[in-house]
């Protein structure tokens, strides 16, 4: 849960409260037992464009 | 120069209580996480609690769960850990350590140590 | 929970000598795998840290490599203060981290 006061973070990152901060949610393919990742899954990844033929 | 100085070790009886502190200096303390590693007598290093920048989160090693707290006190640069119900396996010297400044993936700075003795 | 495995647990060498030190992880931990020197009633001192970068202070003479589950440390080239024992420190679980057993490097 994020801290009291705190700006919501941006898109594609998600509330650390491990390290007081917002963490981006990329890095959990790397590493996915940290905190906030649980926020990731809940919320959709950042924008990209789709490449159509 | 970035310091970290613990205190509060010394000989205690089995489920006898202690509180470490460790003192920090030389850099602004309240963004760092910060951890207790224990080293027992000719041993290997073993992590015992971590808490978050603000204090929020704590967690612990499953042998001292429930019976060592973590805490801090950001205007007094001061790390603490809470030891109650001890053993004679928490028989170790006691570090602090600061986490690296963009994630807990190291530990940059190290206390010097305090013993704890834990015996009859 | 990861179990870290160095070997050897300890080894003779003589200065100049370049020495190697391995660390096993029970699991895949990528690069997050950072080296620690402890001399006798001091504190830990970190080397190296995501597996291959150089701690700020470090002589060049150490280094860090691998990925997955198998890591070294190498010495170059043996110099006197670095007569210690290693150990290796696994953070792919943060904040449960883990440690190695430990390497003592002694003189030949």
């Known amino acids: 849960e994020q801290a009291p006061g705190t700006a919501p973070c941006s898109r594609g990152s998600s509330w650390s409260a491990d390290l007081d901060k917002c963490m981006d949610c990329a890095s959990c393919r790397a590493r996915p037992h940290s905190d906030f990742c649980q926020g990731c899954a809940a919320a959709p990844p950042a924008p990209f464009r789709l490449l159509w033929p | 120069e970035v310091q970290l100085l613990e205190s509060g070790g010394g000989l205690v009886q089995p489920g006898g209580s202690l509180r470490l502190s460790c003192a920090a200096s030389?850099?602004?303390?309240?963004?760092?996480?910060m951890i207790w590693v224990r080293q027992a007598p000719g041993k290997g290093l073993e992590w015992v609690s971590y808490?978050?920048?603000?204090?929020?989160?704590?967690h612990y090693a499953d042998s001292v769960k429930g019976r060592f707290t973590i805490s801090r006190d950001n205007s007094k640069n001061t790390l603490y850990l809470q030891m109650n119900s001890l053993r004679a396996e928490d028989t170790a010297v006691y570090y602090c350590?600061?986490?690296?400044?963009?994630?807990?993936?190291?530990?940059?700075?190290w206390g010097q140590g305090t013993l704890v003795t834990v015996s009859s | 929970d990861i179990q870290m495995t160095q070997s050897p647990s300890s080894l003779s060498a003589s200065v100049g000598d370049r020495v190697t030190i391995t660390c096993r992880a029970s699991q895949s931990i990528s690069g997050y795998l950072n080296w620690y020197q402890q001399k006798p009633g001091k504190a830990p001192k970190l080397l190296i840290y995501q597996a291959s970068s150089l701690q700020s202070g470090v002589p060049s003479r150490f280094s860090g490599s691998g990925s997955g589950t198998d890591f070294t440390l190498t010495i170059s080239s043996l110099q006197p203060e670095d007569f210690a024992t290693y150990y290796c420190q696994q953070s792919y679980t943060s904040p449960f981290i883990t440690f190695g057993q430990g390497t003592k490097v002694e003189i030949k």
């Open positions: 030389g850099f602004t303390f309240s963004p760092y996480p």
């Open positions: 808490i978050s920048p603000s204090g929020g989160s704590t």
């Open positions: 350590a600061r986490g690296g400044d963009t994630y807990f993936d190291y530990f940059d700075y």
